[in-house]
């Protein structure tokens, strides 16, 4: 049964299609394949901590060590990538903190995406000094294993020199790599010695070999690409938001809720209210009022702005986010002070995340 009663004919179901949002990411921990990763559960006063990955209970095994508030992953692999949560169970409540683990190399092989520094890779030689091909920047080629999420862009580089200037060609799994071998083809930037594949899919997995050659010799280098697939997951709310706030009577205040969701999120701001002088209905459930929700007629639903507040506006404000997979909520408190007291952002008081978990 629902854990609330609604007042003023409001509904917690979406009445209008949700609007599109610029979604913010949860904290992301990145590790290269083979590295060890240690994450501390950022929750206080935890009697018992339980861990999940993509919603499934996580127990210790030969690579996963759970000690107190620490999670250790030894010899990380792309399969360790995903949405993790630690839940602190206390005597009166429980609290959950989310983070992402991404076991991946950088998008490009040791380089920025924009290739602005690529010119120095194109080495001109004195025409008299004939020379077989050689690598000019092996640092950019050190990471051979690239594990990237589906839909990302991948760039492999093989900066080389030689005289005459070598040519470069690419093989996939030892065979000539043709444009028709992948939807959308690929780009080769000869002046930057790079291969670029946009919006990778699992069929792009494999070994990519650059072959650099001139009449005096040939060299090659192989990269391994692994494409990490994703599964749909419920919304994640940034820890600590919305934050507790205080203002004087007549002042303005803003609550912010940062949402991360693959799927279309529906955002609601809810407040505990009184009806006929009571905070609870006959069924013992609290009365709640939907103040704002995402929809056609709603401006940025991640922000709840209150203007010219009165003492009646004091209380708990809940940011509740749902998508077709599940939901999450967190709350903050508004303190309304008499006019003679100076208002201040309550930085020292952190909102207790009120996840529906």
């Amino acid at each position: 049964r629902p854990s609330f009663s609604l007042v003023e004919d409001t509904t917690l179901e979406p009445e209008e299609p949700p609007t599109k949002y610029q979604i913010s990411q949860p904290e992301v921990y990145v590790a290269a394949p083979g590295e060890s990763l240690e994450v501390r559960c950022l929750l206080k006063d935890a009697a018992v901590i339980s861990w999940t990955k993509d919603g499934v209970h996580l127990g210790p095994n030969n690579r996963t060590v759970l000690i107190g508030e620490y999670l250790q992953i030894k010899g990380a692999t792309p399969r360790d990538s995903g949405l993790y949560a630690c839940t602190a169970s206390r005597t009166v409540d429980s609290e959950t903190w989310y983070f992402m683990v991404n076991v991946t190399d950088a998008i490009s092989s040791g380089d920025d995406e924009d290739d602005t520094d690529g010119a120095e890779d194109f080495v001109s030689e004195n025409s008299n000094n004939k020379r077989a091909p050689y690598w000019t920047n092996t640092e950019k080629m050190e990471k051979r294993l690239h594990a990237v999420p589906a839909a990302n862009t991948v760039k492999f580089r093989c900066p080389a020199g030689g005289n005459p200037m070598p040519t470069m060609r690419w093989l996939k799994n030892g065979k000539e790599f043709k444009q028709e071998h992948r939807i959308g083809g690929y780009k080769v930037r000869n002046q930057h010695w790079s291969l670029i594949m946009e919006s990778v899919v699992p069929s792009d997995k494999g070994n990519y070999t650059c072959v650099v050659e001139n009449e005096y010799g040939s060299i090659n280098h192989t990269y391994h690409l692994d494409v990490v697939e994703r599964s749909p997951h419920r919304p994640i709310l940034q820890a600590g938001l919305p934050a507790n706030a205080s203002t004087v009577v007549g002042g303005d205040v803003e609550f912010v809720c940062k949402v991360y969701s693959d799927a279309q999120p529906h955002i609601q701001w809810i407040k505990h209210v009184e009806k006929n002088g009571s905070k609870y209905g006959p069924d013992g459930l609290p009365y709640l009022k939907v103040l704002k929700h995402s929809g056609i007629n709603s401006s940025n639903a991640e922000v709840l702005a209150l203007f010219n507040v009165t003492e009646a506006d004091a209380g708990e404000y809940i940011c509740k986010v749902s998508n077709y997979i599940g939901q999450a909520n967190q709350s903050a408190w508004l303190t309304v002070l008499p006019k003679q007291q100076a208002p201040g952002r309550e930085k020292e008081i952190t909102a207790s995340p009120d996840y529906l978990e």
Partner: antibody, heavy 114, light 107 residues
Framework: EVQLQQSGAELVKPGASVKMSCKAS????????VHWVRQTPGQGLEWIGL????????SYNQKFKAKATLTADKSSSAAYMQLSSLTSEDSAVYYC???????WGQGTSLTVSS | DIVMTQSHKFMSTSVGDRVNITCKAS??????VAWYQQKPGQSPKLLIY???YRYSGVPDRFTGSGSGTDFTFTISSVQAEDLAVYYC?????????FGGGTKLEMK
Amino acid sequence: EVQLQQSGAELVKPGASVKMSCKASGYTFSFYNVHWVRQTPGQGLEWIGLIYPDNGDTSYNQKFKAKATLTADKSSSAAYMQLSSLTSEDSAVYYCARGGFDYWGQGTSLTVSS
Amino acid sequence: DIVMTQSHKFMSTSVGDRVNITCKASQDVSTAVAWYQQKPGQSPKLLIYSASYRYSGVPDRFTGSGSGTDFTFTISSVQAEDLAVYYCQQHYSTPYTFGGGTKLEMK
């Protein structure tokens, strides 16, 4: 391994009610919606509604609001759908599915016949 | 309610063929579209979600594309085991609605 195990086939008389179950295992039940979907030869797949087990929040397809009641029991990781005032038009296969529609139960066949 | 229309109820194909199944939404659903495969006597199986994300374990011959109102599901090289009914679904807003299905048959 994630699994959704649904209760067995039902044969009921018109006007009666029926309550079918969907028992979840292999994941944190509270973390995901449970959807209910009806399949008939004539109408194809129809979404009935969802329940979020952690707090009991529900969302219904208006078409089924008077017909279906969704509940969930966190302690047993089970979701339930009760269908009332049954008619022959309610004869169908009813599926439960996890939040992302990534795992489905095997379906419960309901036959309404006098 | 958002109506999802799959214009072809049946499509004939041969092993090795490339097949495109289309789905049109009655209003903008962004990229909130999923594709399912259903074989006789089985439950639907998720293949693609959010228009283009292949679900874990789904063979890479299955791809999805599109946004707004027009969506395409592609099988790059049909295998015998791909003969089934394919449904699109919008998960943009409730009630989540399905297309009528496209049955893939052998020529």
